[in-house]
C-alpha cells in the first residue's frame, strides 16, 4: 500500500514560518500577508517506526521538491540537512532512519525528535531569519515547539 501523506506548513511557537533561503538552507522568520506564500509546504509521510499514542514516526519532505529533512553526523554532532531523493522511490513506508522524526504531541504543540539521534529536535532560534537546525536541548533558549497547519492537496 502507498505511504499515507498529508500537506502542511509548520510554524514555531513564536509564529515564525519556515522558508527556503537559497538552495541549501531552511530558515525561520515572521511572515505576513502575501509573503506567507514563501513558506515551505511539507509533505508529511507516516512511516514505519516505533509508535505510541503521543509519538508518531514521520518523514518531512518539501512538497514536490524531492528534498527531505535528514539527520546526519557532522563534526561528530547530529545535524539537520536537506537531502535529495529519487522521486521514483520516495516517499516509502520504510524510510531510512536518518529521514525519520518522531512527531510528539504535547499540549497542542508538536515536537519533532530525530529517530536517528534520540533527544535531538528540529529547532529554531529566538532570533529572526536564522537556520532551522537540530538541537540537543528542550526548554532552553532555542524553540522546539511547533504548530501544524493543514494545506489542501
Amino acid at each position: 500500500a502507498p505511504v499515507r501523506s498529508l500537506n502542511c506548513t509548520l510554524r514555531d511557537s513564536q509564529q515564525k514560518s519556515l522558508v527556503m533561503s537559497g538552495p541549501y538552507e531552511l530558515k525561520a522568520l515572521h511572515l505576513q500577508g502575501q509573503d506567507m506564500e514563501q513558506q515551505v509546504v511539507f509533505s508529511m509521510s507516516f512511516v514505519q517506526g516505533e509508535e505510541s499514542n503521543d509519538k508518531i514516526p514521520v518523514a518531512l519532505g518539501l512538497k514536490e521538491k524531492n528534498l527531505y529533512l535528514s539527520c546526519v553526523l557532522k563534526d561528530d554532532k547530529p545535524t539537520l540537512q536537506l537531502e535529495s531523493v529519487d522521486p521514483k522511490n520516495y516517499p516509502k513506508k520504510k524510510m531510512e532512519k536518518r529521514f525519520v522524526f518522531n512527531k510528539i504531541e504535547i499540549n497542542n504543540k508538536l515536537e519533532f525528535e530525530s529517530a536517528q539521534f534520540p533527544n535531538w529536535y528540529i529547532s529554531t532560534s529566538q532570533a529572526e531569519n536564522m537556520p532551522v537546525f537540530l538541537g540537543g536541548t528542550k526548554g532552553g533558549q532555542d524553540i522546539t515547539d511547533f504548530t501544524m497547519q493543514f494545506v489542501s492537496s
Partner: antibody
Framework: QVQLVQSGAEVKKPGASVKVSCKAT????????IAWVRQAPGQGLEWMGS????????NYNEKFKGRVTMTRDTSTSTSYMELSSLRSEDTAVYYC?????????????WGQGTLVTVSS | EIVLTQSPATLSLSPGERATLSCRAS??????????MNWYQQKPGQAPRLLIY???NQGSGIPARFSGSGSGTDFTLTISRLEPEDFAVYYC?????????FGQGTKLEIK
C-alpha cells in the same frame, strides 16, 4: 586546503572490473558526500553516483545500477568506485568530486581524474 | 531524467568580446523560486571547475566577468569580456532532481 587525489591510470580487458580510489584531505571526510562523474574521450560529463562516508549512504544512477559499487574507508579518508563487467564504452576519465552541500550541492572540488582504458 | 541542451555547440569569438552560452532543460529546474543550475569550465586535460551555482551565484575565486542568469528551463552563462584563458568547454548541470545531469557542452574557441 581541500584536495581529492585519485589513483593512477588503469588498462582493463572487457568483462573485468576496475576499482578507482579518491583520497580526501583538508576537510573532515565523513562530513561531505563524494560523487563520481565520468567523461568518455571527447564527450560530456556523466554522473554515476554518490556516497556519504559518514553513514555509508549511496545514490546510484540507474544506468549503472548493478555494475557500480561505491565504498569508503574512513580510517584513510578514501572513497572507492568499482565498476564491473567492463566494456569498451566504459573507456573514460573517472573523476571524484565533492558536493558543496548534502548530496545535491554543486561540485566545488574535483579530483584530477583517472583514465580507465578498456581494450582487448 | 532531466535532459539539458546547450547551444551553440561551438562559439567562435575574439578576446575582449562578450560570450553568451545557453542551456535549456527538458523540464523546470526551479525549486522554491531557486534555479538549481550550475555552470563549469573545463580545459583540456583538466578537471571541471565550478563557475556559477544556483543559476546566478559565483563560485569561490571566480572572476566577476562570469555571470549566470535564468529560471525555469532557460539559463544563460555570460562572460562579459573574454580573456585568453576563457577559451575552454563549458557545461551546465542541474541539481534539482536525481540523476544529476550535464549538458553536452559548448566549446568556446578563439576566432
Amino acid at each position: 586546503q581541500v584536495q581529492l587525489v585519485q589513483s593512477g591510470a588503469e588498462v582493463k580487458k572487457p568483462g573485468a572490473s576496475v576499482k578507482v580510489s579518491c583520497k580526501a584531505t583538508g576537510y573532515t571526510f565523513t562530513d561531505y558526500w563524494i560523487a563520481w562523474v565520468r567523461q568518455a574521450p571527447g564527450q560530456g560529463l556523466e554522473w554515476m553516483g554518490s556516497i556519504f562516508p559518514g553513514g555509508d549512504y549511496t545514490n546510484y544512477n540507474e544506468k549503472f545500477k548493478g555494475r557500480v559499487t561505491m565504498t569508503r574507508d574512513t580510517s584513510t579518508s578514501t572513497s572507492y568506485m568499482e565498476l564491473s563487467s567492463l566494456r569498451s564504452e566504459d573507456t573514460a576519465v573517472y573523476y571524484c568530486a565533492r558536493p558543496y552541500y548534502s548530496n545535491y550541492g554543486h561540485f566545488d572540488y574535483w579530483g584530477q581524474g583517472t583514465l580507465v582504458t578498456v581494450s582487448s | 531524467e532531466i535532459v539539458l541542451t546547450q547551444s551553440p555547440a561551438t562559439l567562435s569569438l575574439s578576446p575582449g568580446e562578450r560570450a553568451t552560452l545557453s542551456c535549456r532543460a527538458s523540464e523546470s529546474v526551479d525549486n522554491s523560486g531557486i534555479g538549481f543550475m550550475n555552470w563549469y569550465q573545463q580545459k583540456p586535460g583538466q578537471a571541471p571547475r565550478l563557475l556559477i551555482y544556483a543559476a546566478s551565484n559565483q563560485g569561490s575565486g571566480i572572476p566577476a566577468r562570469f555571470s549566470g542568469s535564468g529560471s525555469g528551463t532557460d539559463f544563460t552563462l555570460t562572460i562579459s569580456r573574454l580573456e585568453p584563458e576563457d577559451f575552454a568547454v563549458y557545461y551546465c548541470q542541474q541539481n534539482k532532481e536525481l540523476p544529476w545531469t550535464f549538458g553536452q557542452g559548448t566549446k568556446l574557441e578563439i576566432k
